[in-house]
Amino acid sequence: SEVEYRAEVGQNAYLPCFYTPAAPGNLVPVCWGKGACPVFECGNVVLRTDERDVNYWTSRYWLNGDFRKGDVSLTIENVTLADSGIYCCRIQIPGIMNDEKFNLKLVIKPAKVTPAPTRQRDFTAAFPRMLTTRGHGPAETQTLGSLPDINLTQISTLANELRDSRLANDLRDSGATIRGSSDYKDDDDKHHHHHH
C-alpha cells in the first residue's frame, strides 16, 4: 500500500523520493506523475529529469532538493483539495526491467481557520521556497533548498529521516543555486526542453 503524506489547503506539499547516484553527476532519469505508477513511465507526467537536468515541469511542481545528489523529492505549491491522490515517483535505472517505482498518497486537509494571523509552519518548512522566480527565461538563477550530503544506501522514501528535526535545521541552513537552461520553453503551464 502507498505511504501517506498530508498537507493543508494553501500549503506546499512535500513528497519524498531518493536514490543514490552511482557516481557524482552520474544521474538517472526520473519522472513524477499524478496517479499510481504504471508499468512504464509515470501516469500523467508533471515533472521529469534526464541525465543532466530537470527537463520538463508543470506549474506548481518542482524539486526543492539537490537532485544531483539523488534527492528527487517533489514539492507541490499551494495545494488544493484537487491535489489529493496517488503520485508516482519512478527512478528510471537503465537496463533490463530495472526501474524503481514508489506510490505516495497525498491527503489534503481543509485549511484550519485561525483567529489571528500567525506565521504558519507547515510540514514542508524544512524545504525553503525558491528565493528567486522559477526558470521562466534563459539562464535565470533559481535558489533551491538542498539536502545535506547524507548517506543514502538505497532508494527509499526515507520518511523517518525527513521527520527528524535536525535534518530540517540542516536543510533550512543550506542552499544551492542552479541555472535554468536557456532552451527551456515557456508555455505558461508547462516547461520543458526536448529529451533528445
Partner: antibody, heavy 122, light 107 residues
Framework: EVKLVESGGGLVQPGGSLRLSCAAS????????MAWVRQAPGKGLEWVAN????????YYLDSLKSRFTISRDNAKNSLYLQMNSLRAEDTAVYYC???????????????WGQGTLVTVSS | DIQMTQSPSSLSASVGDRVTITCRAS??????LAWYQQKPGKAPKLLIY???TLAEGVPSRFSGSGSGTDFTLTISSLQPEDFATYYC?????????FGQGTKLEIK
Amino acid sequence: EVKLVESGGGLVQPGGSLRLSCAASGFTFSDYYMAWVRQAPGKGLEWVANINYDGSSTYYLDSLKSRFTISRDNAKNSLYLQMNSLRAEDTAVYYCARDVGYYGGNYGFAYWGQGTLVTVSS
Amino acid sequence: DIQMTQSPSSLSASVGDRVTITCRASDNIYSYLAWYQQKPGKAPKLLIYNAKTLAEGVPSRFSGSGSGTDFTLTISSLQPEDFATYYCQQHYGSPLTFGQGTKLEIK
C-alpha cells in the same frame, strides 16, 4: 499518417535465429516507447517486450528474456527484435506497436503494424 | 503476474443490440486498462485506453468504464462492422497481460 511496417519473418528451424524489423513513420519515433506483441495461430495476444525512448531500458516477458532482445535505432526510425534459439511455440504473427509517449497519459497500444509471420518448424 | 479474465468468451448478438463485455483483473490495476478490437487476419485496433478514454477515430457507441479490478466495454448499438474479437489489456504491472478474448458473433 502513422505507419508501422514489420519485416523479417519467415520459416526457421528449431534452434535457429531471426531478426524482425519494424519501420516507423508519421510520428516522432524517439518520443515513444515501442513494443512487440505476438499472436500464435488461433490464439490470443501475448506481450513480448518493450523498449524506452532511447533504448536504455528494456522490458521482457520473463520466459523470453534469455532468448529475445529488443532494440531500436532512432536515427533510422526502426525497432528490432532479435530472436535466438527459436522453438515451435514461438510460431506466431509478431506485431510492432507504439506504446506510451514522453509525457505519459495514454496507456494502450495506439498503433500496430500489419504483423509478420514467424514459423518455427523442421 | 496480473491475470486478466474476460467474460463471456463468446457472445451472439444482433445489429442494434446493446452489448457488454467485462474484464476482471486479478489485482488492482487502477485505470490502466485498454480495450482492442481485432478482425480475422488483421492487427488489433485500440478502442479505449485508461479504462474509459475513447481512442482517436473510434465511434462514440463504444464506451469503457471501471477501475481497480472490474472493467466493462459497452457497445450501445451494434453495427455490422462490430462483429469481431475484443481483448482487454492491463498496463499496470509487468508483464503486460491481455484477456483471453471475447468473440462477438452475429445471432
